[in-house]
Interface confidence: low
C-alpha cells in the first residue's frame, strides 16, 4: 500500500461556518435503497446545508429521509448561534477556546483555525465540514481575536 498522504477535497464552500448537526444521521448520504418505487422524499445535504429532494425506491435506505421539507428542516437544521466576539467587557477566553481540535465526523477536509491551548496560539487544522466544536474559525484573525491573549 502507498504511504502517500491522500488529500480529500469534498466540501467546496469555505465561507460557511462550522455545521452543527442536531442528529448524526443528518450527515448520511441520500440513499434510494434497492427497491424500484419512485417516491419523492427529502434529505439533508451537508454540503449545501439545505434539505433537498431525492427519489426513494421504497425500501431500506437510511434515516436521512423525510416525507416533507418541513420535517427535514425540523430534524436537521437549526440556527447557528452567533459567534462570541471578545469585547472590553469580556476579557476571559470563551470556554470553547480550550476544546481540543475536532475535525468532526465528516470528511470535507477544509482548512480552518483552532486555538491550541498547549502552544497558546491559533493554528491551522483540517475540518471535516460538520459537527466538531466551536474551537473552529474561518480565519486566523478571528481565532486570534477571540482566543489569543
Amino acid at each position: 500500500d502507498s504511504e502517500e498522504d491522500e488529500e480529500h477535497t469534498i466540501i467546496t464552500d469555505t465561507e460557511l461556518p462550522p455545521l452543527k448537526l442536531m442528529h448524526s444521521f443528518c450527515a448520511f448520504k441520500a440513499d434510494d435503497g434497492p427497491c424500484k418505487a419512485i417516491m419523492k422524499r427529502f434529505f439533508f445535504n451537508i454540503f449545501t446545508r439545505q434539505c433537498e429532494e431525492f427519489i426513494y425506491g421504497g425500501c431500506e435506505g437510511n434515516q436521512n429521509r423525510f416525507e416533507s421539507l418541513e420535517e427535514c428542516k425540523k430534524m436537521c437544521t437549526r440556527d447557528n448561534a452567533n459567534r462570541i466576539i471578545k469585547t472590553t467587557l469580556q476579557q476571559e477566553k470563551p470556554d470553547f477556546c480550550f476544546l481540543e481540535e475536532d475535525p468532526g465526523i465528516c470528511r470535507g477536509y477544509i482548512t480552518r483555525y483552532f486555538y491550541n491551548n498547549q502552544t497558546k496560539q491559533c493554528e491551522r487544522f483540517k475540518y471535516g465540514g460538520c459537527l466538531g466544536n466551536m474551537n473552529n474559525f474561518e480565519t486566523l484573525e478571528e481565532c486570534k481575536n477571540i482566543c489569543e491573549d
Epitope: D1, S2, E3, E4, D5, E6, H23, S24, F25, A27, F28, K29, D31, I46, N62, Q63, E100, E101, D102, P103, G104, I105, C106, R107, F125, K126, G128
Partner: antibody, heavy 125, light 107 residues
Framework: QVQLVQSGAEVKKPGASVKVSCKAS????????MHWVRQAPGQGLEWMGW????????NYAQKFQGRVTMTRDTSISTAYMELSRLRSDDTAVYYC??????????????????WGQGTLVTVSS | AIQLTQSPSSLSASVGDRVTITCRAS??????LAWYQQKPGKAPKLLIY???TLQSGVPSRFSGSGSGTDFTLTISSLQPEDFATYYC?????????FGQGTKLEIK
C-alpha cells in the same frame, strides 16, 4: 495485511509515566485515526481518545485530559500513547485500534476494525 | 456522555442455541453502534458495525439489529468458538463508550 504491533509489557511505580507504542503496517498510516482503549483486569473496555496521524490532532476523553498525550511519527508509521502521574488503578492492558475518520456521509465503513495485541501496564509500588 | 447498558451481564447456553444480547443507549445514537467479541488474553474483534453490517470474515450466524436506543446481537446457532465476552460500543458522540460486557458461557 493490516497489522498493529504494540510495545512490550511495562511495570511502573505510582507517579511515573509510561509510553506505549503502536506500529502500523499494511495500510496508509495517515489515512486513519488511531484510537487507544484500555481494559483493567477483569473489567470492560474504556475509550481514551484518538490521534489523527495526518494532522497530529487529538481528541481525549475528559477523564484522561491533562494526563494523556497521544503523538505519532509518520516516518515510521507509529502512534504513541503516554500516560503520566500513574496510579494503581491505571493498571490495565492498553490497546491501539485503527479507526476511520468518523463518518464519510454513510456509516458504511468498519471502525475499530484492527487492534493491536495489547500492552500490559502494571502500576505498583 | 452516552451510557450503554448490556443485558444480560452473563449468560449460559449450549452449542446450537440461539442467543440474543441487548444493548440500550441512554440517548438516541442512530445506527452508530458496533459489537465486539473478546476472548481471554486477546484483543476485541469487530463483529458488527453500523448496527447491522457484518464485518468481513465474520460468520453469518452473527447478526445485529436496532436503531436509536435499542440494539440486539443475535447468534443464530452457537458454536464452541463463540463462548466469549461481547461488548457493544457507540460511535455517535464523544466520549465514545462501551457497554459493560456480556459473558457467554457454556451450560
Amino acid at each position: 495485511q493490516v497489522q498493529l504491533v504494540q510495545s512490550g509489557a511495562e511495570v511502573k511505580k505510582p507517579g511515573a509515566s509510561v509510553k506505549v507504542s503502536c506500529k502500523a503496517s499494511g495500510y496508509t498510516f495517515t489515512g486513519y485515526y488511531m484510537h487507544w482503549v484500555r481494559q483493567a483486569p477483569g473489567q470492560g473496555l474504556e475509550w481514551m481518545g484518538w490521534i489523527n496521524p495526518n494532522s497530529g490532532g487529538t481528541n481525549y476523553a475528559q477523564k484522561f485530559q491533562g494526563r494523556v498525550t497521544m503523538t505519532r511519527d509518520t516516518s515510521i508509521s507509529t502512534a504513541y500513547m503516554e500516560l503520566s502521574r500513574l496510579r494503581s488503578d491505571d493498571t490495565a492492558v492498553y490497546y491501539c485500534a485503527r479507526g476511520i475518520a468518523r463518518l464519510q456521509w454513510l456509516p458504511t465503513e468498519a471502525d475499530f476494525d484492527y487492534w493491536g495485541q495489547g500492552t500490559l501496564v502494571t502500576v505498583s509500588s | 456522555a452516552i451510557q450503554l447498558t448490556q443485558s444480560p451481564s452473563s449468560l449460559s447456553a449450549s452449542v446450537g442455541d440461539r442467543v440474543t444480547i441487548t444493548c440500550r443507549a441512554s440517548q438516541g445514537i442512530s445506527s452508530s453502534l458496533a459489537w465486539y467479541q473478546q476472548k481471554p488474553g486477546k484483543a476485541p474483534k469487530l463483529l458488527i458495525y453500523a448496527a447491522s453490517t457484518l464485518q468481513s470474515g465474520v460468520p453469518s450466524r452473527f447478526s445485529g439489529s436496532g436503531s436509536g436506543t435499542d440494539f440486539t446481537l443475535t447468534i443464530s446457532s452457537l458454536q464452541p468458538e463463540d463462548f466469549a465476552t461481547y461488548y457493544c460500543q457507540q460511535l455517535d458522540s464523544y466520549p465514545l463508550s462501551f457497554g459493560q460486557g456480556t459473558k457467554l458461557e457454556i451450560k
